[in-house]
């Protein structure tokens, strides 16, 4: 997958929807300049391609949705990388430009005669891409041409700004909400001193910024904050881990506003350096409940608490997907490459990966083996349905009483489509209401997951709570087998009675040394001792002063007993 030749998946239709999926991993650092993508991806790639193809089939066969109009698609690979996605988006735009020029009779042959050549239909909207950083770059381009974009996993808060990203919408909430959920978890377990890590790029940066802002308001201190690229080398991850250990044993909790592959990089470094079990990772939805993050590094991931967008598995997708075979699935141009990668074998007569695998693929192989549905599948499907319902509502208002595309919809006006999309609401694939607020965002519902050792060498994610529009619910007994197991992540222990906190110069407010007040002083507040006035003395609990009762000597009282300084 280098920059010279990009594969595209096509499905014909009256209206064409574009899609950007990360069919391959992002280019490694040394391959970035040539935009050479990494290995093929199943959950984030192939499954999403198939979801698009099959969802469109379902929409096209639904007589109540866009009757007499067939939806088609053009799917391109973003490789989870801005440069690749931009290159692919330019292809979408080029198609649209050529088409609109044709509509206006601007396409002519060199000799001056008009062209009989029909180019591809224009893209009316784009689904995806997955990454926030990549989505921002794509949106910067698409909005110039009034092409609406619906994202299924780009959650950056920046994308809520409609002055900057007018044609952007999403079926997922903004990260401001999960940052709040993460802070609520930190608060729940009285973790007041945590380390912070985020993935370089928009998703991690804006998410961590929100986490830090909210933490500060709640009196939570950040020991240190670090950033790293998902495709950074081993050395970079090792260095980061060593830096994190310098805050041990105080900052045992590491809040990671990270993409899944960043978390995997951290887990691998923990293995290399012998740091399994030293940290508790609190991960954002980039990690969620993904097995491709923890596979092979389960011991390092144990105990991790993660945020996952609420999205149950879609049964009908599995029914379709698990029957797919390389000899019959020709509409997905990446499927054979994926099959070989998935089963580490060679398909007869398939040239691309021949050198890599020695054994030939067995005909009994099936996708049912170790199948895990993409955790964001519901959102991908909801994004596609949103586009369909938006087009449906647009058709109803522009072509009343007409089945199919009327002239008022030729060509489709992106501004009108955006208007229609923003008003769309329907029941999503999981039975929840899909709607968009004035920023094009959807409401926030999260599940809280915990990665646990369930038995000898068997690990899994367990649902231990939920966060729904500001309310956190946690099953503490499921996370911690007993109260004493709750990990501590604090800089300083509370001071004893009669002591005040002294914060060292340059330290955060969570780190102090405890100093006792002087004999004649009481604790005025947690940072100050105050001397009792003459004639008074600190109370037993040292919270104030009591007047010293005046005792008058009378004739006949025994003489006072004077002691010299050197009397012991």
């Amino acid at each position: 997958q280098s920059s010279e030749r990009r594969v595209v998946a096509h499905m014909p239709g009256d209206i064409i929807i574009g899609a950007l999926f990360s069919v391959h991993h992002q280019p490694t650092v040394d391959k970035v300049h040539e935009r050479k993508c990494g290995a093929v991806r199943e959950q984030y790639g192939i499954q999403r391609v198939e979801a698009m193809l099959h969802t469109l089939e379902r929409i096209n066969s639904d007589p109540t949705l866009l009757p007499n109009i067939t939806l088609g698609c053009e799917i391109r690979d973003s490789c989870w990388h801005s440069a690749v996605a931009l290159e692919q988006s330019i292809e979408f735009i080029r198609d649209s430009l050529i088409s609109s020029e044709e509509e206006e009779g601007l396409v002519r042959c060199v000799d001056g005669s008009s062209s009989s050549f029909r180019s591809k239909k224009p893209i009316v909207g784009v689904i995806g891409p997955g990454s926030s950083s990549v989505a921002i770059q794509v949106q910067n381009l698409l909005q110039l041409f009034n092409i609406p974009q619906i994202a299924y996993s780009a959650t950056s808060m920046d994308l809520s700004d409609k002055t900057l990203f007018k044609y952007f919408m999403r079926v997922v909430p903004s990260d401001a909400q999960q940052a709040r959920a993460m802070v609520d978890i930190v608060k729940r377990y009285n973790w007041t001193y945590v380390s912070a890590v985020h993935t370089e790029g928009n998703y991690g940066e804006s998410g961590m910024e929100a986490f830090k802002d909210m933490s500060a308001k709640e009196g939570i201190c950040i020991a240190h904050s670090y950033k790293i690229y998902s495709n950074a080398g081993e050395q970079s991850f090792d260095k980061l881990l060593k830096k994190l250990t310098s805050h041990l044993p105080k900052a045992r909790v590491v809040a990671c506003f990270c993409e899944g592959m960043t978390v995997r990089g951290l887990l691998m470094a923990m293995r290399r350096l012998g740091l399994a079990g030293e940290f508790l990772l609190l991960g954002s939805d980039g990690w969620a409940d993904r097995y491709d993050v923890t596979d092979g590094y389960q011991r390092e991931a144990v105990g991790g608490i993660t945020i996952k967008l609420q999205s149950p598995d879609v049964k009908w997708f599995d029914d379709y997907y698990l029957k797919l075979r390389p000899e019959t699935n020709h509409r997905n141009p990446w499927f054979q490459e994926f099959w070989q990668h998935r089963f580490q074998c060679r398909l007869e007569g398939f040239p691309q990966e021949n050198s890599k695998y020695n054994k030939t693929c067995d005909s009994s192989l099936t996708l049912k083996t170790h199948h895990v549905q993409d955790s964001k599948m519901g959102f991908v499907i909801n994004a596609i349905y949103s586009m369909a319902y938006g087009l449906h509502n647009m058709q109803m208002s522009l072509c009343p009483g007409y089945a199919g595309l009327c002239d008022a919809m030729k060509p489709i006006d992106g501004r009108k489509l955006l208007e229609s999309l923003m008003k769309t609401n329907f029941t999503g694939v999981s039975g929840d209401m899909i709607l968009f607020d004035e920023n094009g965002d959807s409401p926030g519902r999260y599940e809280i997951m915990n990665f646990k050792e369930m038995g000898k060498d068997y690990f899994d994610y367990i649902n231990v709570g939920s966060w729904d529009n500001g309310e956190l619910k946690m099953d503490d007994d499921e996370v911690w087998s007993k109260k004493s197991n709750i990990i501590r992540s604090v800089c300083s222990e509370p001071c004893e009675k009669g002591q005040i906190k002294v914060i060292r110069k340059g330290e955060v407010s969570c780190c102090w040394t405890c100093t006792p007040c002087k004999e004649n002083e009481y604790v005025f507040d947690e940072y100050t001792c105050k001397a009792c006035q003459l004639g008074s003395w600190p109370t037993d609990d040292l919270t104030g002063c009591d007047l010293i009762p005046v005792q008058y000597l009378r004739w006949g009282d025994p003489e006072p007993d004077y002691k010299d300084d050197d009397d012991k």
């Epitope: 090792d238 060593k242 250990t245 041990l248 044993p249 045992r252 350096l273 012998g274 740091l275």
Partner: antibody, heavy 116, light 110 residues
Framework: QSVEESGGRLVTPGTPLTLTCTVS????????MGWVRQAPGKGLEWIGI?????NAWYANWVKGRFTISKTSTTVDLKITSPTTEDTATYFC?????????????WGQGTLVTVSS | AYDMTQTPSSVSAAVGGTVTIKCQAS??????LSWYQQKPGQPPKLLIY???TLASGVSSRFSGSGSGTEFTLTISDLECADAATYYC????????????FGGGTEVVVK
């Protein structure tokens, strides 16, 4: 702050032996503690370390021959089945961090002699 | 494995001279390397940590350099008291380690 090893003596092969490292002025919940040995006339050989968290790590060659554990003021090194090759001076040392970096405080060592 | 190779095993130099000891890691350990001095009948003493930081109370005649896999300890203006065995130690990883210490270098002062 100090570190002192004890328990070194003459033992016959196969007789389990526990060496104890007693610390003073050191918070074992904040610092990792390591064990290093030195056979007569030979170099330093790292045995293992116990992190502040209580997790222990060992050199590849250890393979169950040694176990490190700790209480709030002591760190134990159990030699499960000593052989004559285990004859050495055993040092206990404090790591400067909670995990693994460098040893900035060493005990004087305790001599273990394994002989039949 | 993270293994340390020290060279030479023995070196001799005159008082006032300079000695250089090299330590090579089997794979990159960034700057997580320390140097120790050990005299007969005594425990090792920390000289340098993180490749180049002098431990407190150690003479500035000792200096360390290097990063990645190649490291150097330099003793300048040699004194009789510097006669000892010197060891390097990687502080990078405890996973897959045969010996965290180098084999040692004996310094003889003439």
């Amino acid at each position: 702050q100090s570190v002192e090893e004890s328990g070194g003596r003459l033992v016959t092969p196969g007789t389990p032996l526990t060496l104890t490292c007693t610390v003073s002025g050191i918070d074992l919940s904040s610092n990792a503690m390591g064990w290093v040995r030195q056979a007569p006339g030979k170099g330093l050989e790292w045995i293992g370390i116990i992190y502040a968290s209580g997790n222990a790590w060992y050199a590849n060659w250890v393979k169950g021959r040694f176990t490190i554990s700790k209480t709030s003021t002591t760190v134990d090194l159990k030699i499960t089945s000593p052989t004559t090759e285990d004859t050495a001076t055993y040092f206990c040392a404090r790591d400067a961090t909670a995990t693994w970096d460098y040893f900035n405080l060493w005990g004087q060592g305790t001599l273990v002699t394994v002989s039949s | 494995a993270y293994d340390m190779t020290q060279t030479p095993s023995s070196v001799s130099a005159a008082v006032g001279g300079t000695v250089t000891i090299k330590c090579q890691a089997s794979q990159s350990i960034s700057n997580w390397l320390s140097w120790y001095q050990q005299k007969p009948g005594q425990p090792p003493k920390l000289l340098i940590y993180r490749a180049s930081t002098l431990a407190s109370g150690v003479s500035s005649r000792f200096s360390g350099s290097g990063s990645g896999t190649e490291f150097t300890l330099t003793i300048s203006d040699l004194e009789c008291a510097d006669a000892a065995t010197y060891y390097c130690q990687q502080g990078y990883s405890v996973a897959n380690v045969d010996n965290a210490f180098g084999g040692g270098t004996e310094v003889v002062v003439k």
